[in-house]
């Protein structure tokens, strides 16, 4: 014999309060498959949640974070703080930036340092996680003799090379 | 040299299973990005199957691969594989294995930054 | 999830300014996670722009990414003869789970 609460479909459930009759889910609650024997409460989106769907008789509402949050863990799970200046956004959350890079930016990736060396220059001021290096006049202007001391040049964009 | 090799038959019979493997050389997986598998059918785009995330073996899997697609991962040999059931003549395809990017930190950053030539596979009897 | 790009295909000369889009159906994680990606015949699929507007390693200076959220442009300032080939955009998104797609492809071809 066929089960009769199989004829129940999504949005309702099977009541056996009722002589097992296809029942509409109540307010606030949704059934996503048929042939259910109750409904599920909706999830609510409250504090540092905001609601991106809203639940319907037949699916779960859906939530993402407040600005100045990012969603992580399965469905939004949970809301982290956007990350810091020297930090970057993985699928692990945030994380801080490796020895040798920096992001001073509470978006983006790290970067690495630029190297001063490349431009024929020496280190003025050491990178941090959260700053790139300065780079300075280049070690021949630092000998004695030398009339003028150049102003630090800008720092390149560094290439990223994910590896 | 950093590389991704697919390997695996050519030539499959509908209704069996799909089997290829991704072996990895230049590094190794010590880190918490994803391994993945994408397709692509001729003359078609590309279509992602599914990843495994090599820190703690998490799989993720396309909506239409559920049920019909396991990805497992063997850190002893370096490789991760693709296993596809009950294959139709619409699962002809190069299938690509390809790396997730990783921070400098080591973590997954979402986007693929490494991939494999391509095998491609023939599903017919 | 659906990512459309458009236009499917285009052609175009050398030294032309060629912009490519890509509309998500949902917003990717972050609001960036959006990568674009070049795909010649035969050939596996290449990193070209990643978080939406940031270049590949090695990749010129031409090529140029923007936008957030759910709609993303990939720009070619002045095509080069190298140029021609299909490409693609691709989207991390965290819904019950980590999911990832990819767009229906342009292919640039000479005109």
């Known amino acids: 014999l066929q089960d009769p609460c199989s004829n129940c479909p999504a949005g309702t459930f099977c009541d056996n309060n009722r002589n097992q009759i296809c029942s509409p889910c109540p307010p606030n609650s949704f059934s996503s498959a048929g042939g259910q024997r109750t409904c599920d409460i909706c999830r609510q989106c409250k504090g540092v949640f905001r609601t991106r769907k809203e639940c319907s008789s037949t699916s779960n509402a859906e939530c993402d974070c407040t600005p100045g949050f990012h969603c992580l863990g399965a469905g939004c799970s949970m809301c982290e703080q956007d990350c810091k200046q020297g930090q970057e956004l993985t699928k692990k959350g945030c994380k801080d930036c490796c020895f040798g890079t920096f992001n001073d930016q509470k978006r983006g990736i790290c970067r690495p340092w630029t190297n001063c060396s490349l431009d024929g220059k020496s280190v003025l001021v050491n990178g941090t996680k959260e700053r790139d290096v300065v780079c300075g006049p280049s070690p021949a202007d630092l000998s004695p003799g030398a009339s003028s001391v150049t102003p630090p040049a800008p720092a390149r964009e560094p290439g990223h090379s994910p590896q | 040299q950093v590389q991704l090799q697919e390997s695996g038959p050519g030539l499959v019979k509908p209704s069996e299973t799909l089997s290829l493997t991704c072996k990895v050389s230049?590094?190794?997986?010590?880190?918490?990005?994803?391994m993945c598998w994408i397709r692509q059918p001729p003359g078609k785009g590309l279509e992602w199957i599914g990843c495994?995330?090599?820190?703690?073996?998490?799989?993720y899997y396309a909506s239409w691969a559920k049920g019909r697609v396991t990805i497992s991962v063997d850190s002893s040999k370096n490789q991760f594989s693709l296993k596809l059931s009950s294959v139709t003549a619409a699962d002809t395809a190069v299938y690509y294995c390809?790396?997730?990017?990783?921070?400098?930190?080591?973590?997954?950053?979402?986007?693929?930054?490494?991939w494999g030539q391509g095998t491609l596979v023939t599903v017919s009897s | 999830i659906q990512m459309t790009q458009s236009p499917s295909s285009l052609s175009a000369s050398v030294g032309d300014r060629v912009t490519i889009t890509c509309q998500s159906s949902?917003?990717?994680?972050?609001?960036?996670?959006l990568a674009w990606y070049q795909q010649k015949p035969g050939k596996a699929p290449k990193l070209l722009i990643y978080?939406?507007?940031n270049l590949a390693s090695g990749v010129p200076s031409r090529f140029s990414g923007s936008g957030s959220g759910t709609d993303f442009t990939l720009t070619i300032s002045s095509l080069q003869p190298e140029d021609f080939a299909t490409y693609y955009c691709?989207?991390?998104?965290?819904?019950?789970?980590?999911?990832?797609?990819f767009g229906t492809g342009t292919k640039v071809t000479v005109l």
């Open positions: 390809a790396r997730e990017a990783a921070s400098s930190s080591g973590y997954g950053m979402g986007y693929f930054d490494l």
């Open positions: 230049g590094f190794s997986f010590n880190n918490d990005y994803d």
């Open positions: 495994i995330d090599t820190g703690d073996g998490s799989t």
């Open positions: 949902q917003s990717v994680y972050d609001n960036n996670w």
């Open positions: 978080r939406a507007s």
């Open positions: 691709q989207g991390t998104y965290l819904s019950s789970n980590w999911y990832w797609a």
